[in-house]
Amino acid sequence: MVADPPRDSKGLAAAEPTANGGLALASIEDQGAAAGGYCGSRDQVRRCLRANLLVLLTVVAVVAGVALGLGVSGAGGALALGPERLSAFVFPGELLLRLLRMIILPLVVCSLIGGAASLDPGALGRLGAWALLFFLVTTLLASALGVGLALALQPGAASAAINASVGAAGSAENAPSKEVLDSFLDLARNIFPSNLVSAAFRSYSTTYEERNITGTRVKVPVGQEVEGMNILGLVVFAIVFGVALRKLGPEGELLIRFFNSFNEATMVLVSWIMWYAPVGIMFLVAGKIVEMEDVGLLFARLGKYILCCLLGHAIHGLLVLPLIYFLFTRKNPYRFLWGIVTPLATAFGTSSSSATLPLMMKCVEENNGVAKHISRFILPIGATVNMDGAALFQCVAAVFIAQLSQQSLDFVKIITILVTATASSVGAAGIPAGGVLTLAIILEAVNLPVDHISLILAVDWLVDRSCTVLNVEGDALGAGLLQNYVDRTESRSTEPELIQVKSELPLDPLPVPTEEGNPLLKHYRGPAGDATVASEKESVM
């Protein structure tokens, strides 16, 4: 369908704009310009803009969305949007969400099956263990930062945080009441779905029924399926299935290739959707701002809480995570972050880690040189279990509520908050109604009132976006760290531990290790056995 890219005199494919607006192929220096933005001459500036077109469009879309939202909500009068008009206004954004959600299921399943099948079990185990360790440590650090910031800034003790108009009955009705044990049992049940088809759109959740048993009313747990993809179950199944396919040896080869091809086709769709992302993001952000009734009052009342959350997310995302990345890789973390601006902005716009997953995969592979078998194995797991942003927000919220209700927090309680926030953020993907329910679990664990959860919900639309950005950033940096780990271990050992994803070109040739520094260049042996022919992954856009 797509013609071979033109070749220059050295036999390398000429620079072509890729689906995400970056350069599919360029010299190392040009890649530097694309990622880091060193644009000198007019020609370089033009190339730089072209390389970063989608990134710039996405950033502009967020800013334009805020401006549009404020403009529409400020205009009022004839422009005032009722619920029916609002849904039409947000429609382009809704379309983006639907497109991304459409892609999630085949992407997660196929990429994980392909990823797990392309790694030998030992390497898979090591990679998974390092990934989980990274996710756990960073989540714990985020939790500690959240608690520390909230104790220092005291958002709940600020007079503006609450006022007399906040009803005494707060939100007892809004606060989900669920036993901590049942929440974690639901998590375990969702890891092992009883029906794979229904796991694609339903999760298991425990509710309660009051029954009269010998004259006493007893709360009996009742299991039921609730709306919402059981992503955790699908992730676990896909990994195990991938390992099983690898165990089959030659018999499983065909199916592995099928899943890899399916994955490649899905990524082609992603590359098309990416160009629509800025439009969708703009309307999602604008729609949310229009929807908010009194943003000013909300900020006046909860300003310090919002500041605490956003500041925590900024410190963790711009200092802590990059520092960890730098310490382990000795590479510029901000260049890495520049390469994933589009998915980060998409995360802000969609407020969904899984919806951002397709774009993140594409960007870390094409802009940041993360190998496919790593990104497609690590990122879906990260999107499911790595929630630094959520853990940080929950810790801030717990301390905020403690301060708001003048409840003391001793050392034991603070440790309990840290541990519970870390554990429940890891399990949040397996718990339907994630954020608020996991916050309720933390509050229950330290005997804090759940009444003020309604205050947290009031600004969740903003804080949750910030959470999502941090969550997906953590996933991407984790993938980058693991790529570095793999590079180091492979350069030390003579035999590579990891085999390439098998469907990158026609079925016959096996690739030799990729050229250092440019993961987008793959050298394959030509018909005559020479290794001079360079092939580029087809750029569809």
Epitope: A157, A158, S159, A161, I162, N163, A164, A168, A169, G170, A172, A175, S177, Y208, K219, Q403, L404, S405, Q406, Q407, S408, E444, N447, L448, P449, V450, D451
Partner: antibody, heavy 120, light 107 residues
């Protein structure tokens, strides 16, 4: 030891204002919330609301919004309950009660109570 | 608001008796149940918080139990100073609500 000492009984005409005080001692005043509880003659206890003693922010129960005002003077560790315009149904004993800083909402120390009688 | 229902509303007992007062909440209050004792013309005194924890200075003959919506206060051996009115109170959600009281009298 921890003590909450309330002002003496009050006899008021309908429409008059009243201010009841509650002086705390034996603990750090701004660490614990202060609640107010009403007990009408021969009746049970009714929670009126509480005041955040650190932030000075009051929270009122649904039946006590409007004429009732909770305030503080942290320099003398004292909480106040003010009723702007008393009515006959305000006749009751009013207790200040220290809100515990643990296990959500309970009251570990109480003032002796201030009896308010509203009569024309 | 959560309704609290105490039973019985009054009871007569003799010194040394074992007495049980029950309290039922209109919804699950997750053990945030507290008990107070009030004598005529006096302020209430906290006896038990969080279902079963004895407040400092409260004699060990007082004990509490229960879960979900049903809770009990037990006095293992009645003493002369125990004759008073007892209130239960839920501290699960705002507003905190009290039971109507149980008056314990000498038989």
């Amino acid at each position: 030891q921890i003590q909450l000492v309330q002002s003496g009984p009050e006899l008021k005409k309908p429409g008059a204002p009243v201010k009841i005080s509650c002086k705390a001692s034996g603990y750090t005043f701004t660490t614990f919330g202060m609640s107010w509880v009403k007990q009408a003659p021969g009746q049970g206890l009714k929670w009126m609301g509480w005041i955040h003693t650190y932030a000075g922010v009051p929270i009122y129960g649904d039946d006590f919004k409007g004429r009732f005002v909770f305030s503080l003077d942290t320099s003398v560790s004292t909480a106040y309950l003010q009723i702007s315009s008393v009515k006959a149904e305000d006749t009751a004993t009013y207790f200040c009660a220290r809100r515990s800083d643990n296990y959500r909402y309970f009251f570990d120390y109480w003032g002796q109570g201030t009896t308010l009688t509203v009569s024309s | 608001d959560i309704q609290m229902t105490q039973s019985p509303s009054s009871l007569s007992a003799s010194l040394g008796d074992r007495v049980t007062i029950t309290c039922r909440a209109s919804q699950d209050i997750r053990n945030y149940l507290n008990w107070y004792q009030q004598k005529p013309g006096k302020a209430p005194k906290l006896l038990i918080y969080y279902t079963s924890r004895l407040h400092s200075g409260v004699p060990s003959r007082f004990s509490g139990s229960g879960s979900g919506t049903d809770y009990t206060l037990t006095i293992s051996s009645l003493q002369p100073e125990d004759f008073a009115t007892y209130f239960c109170q839920q501290g699960h959600t705002l507003p905190p609500t009290f039971g109507q009281g149980t008056k314990l009298e000498i038989k």
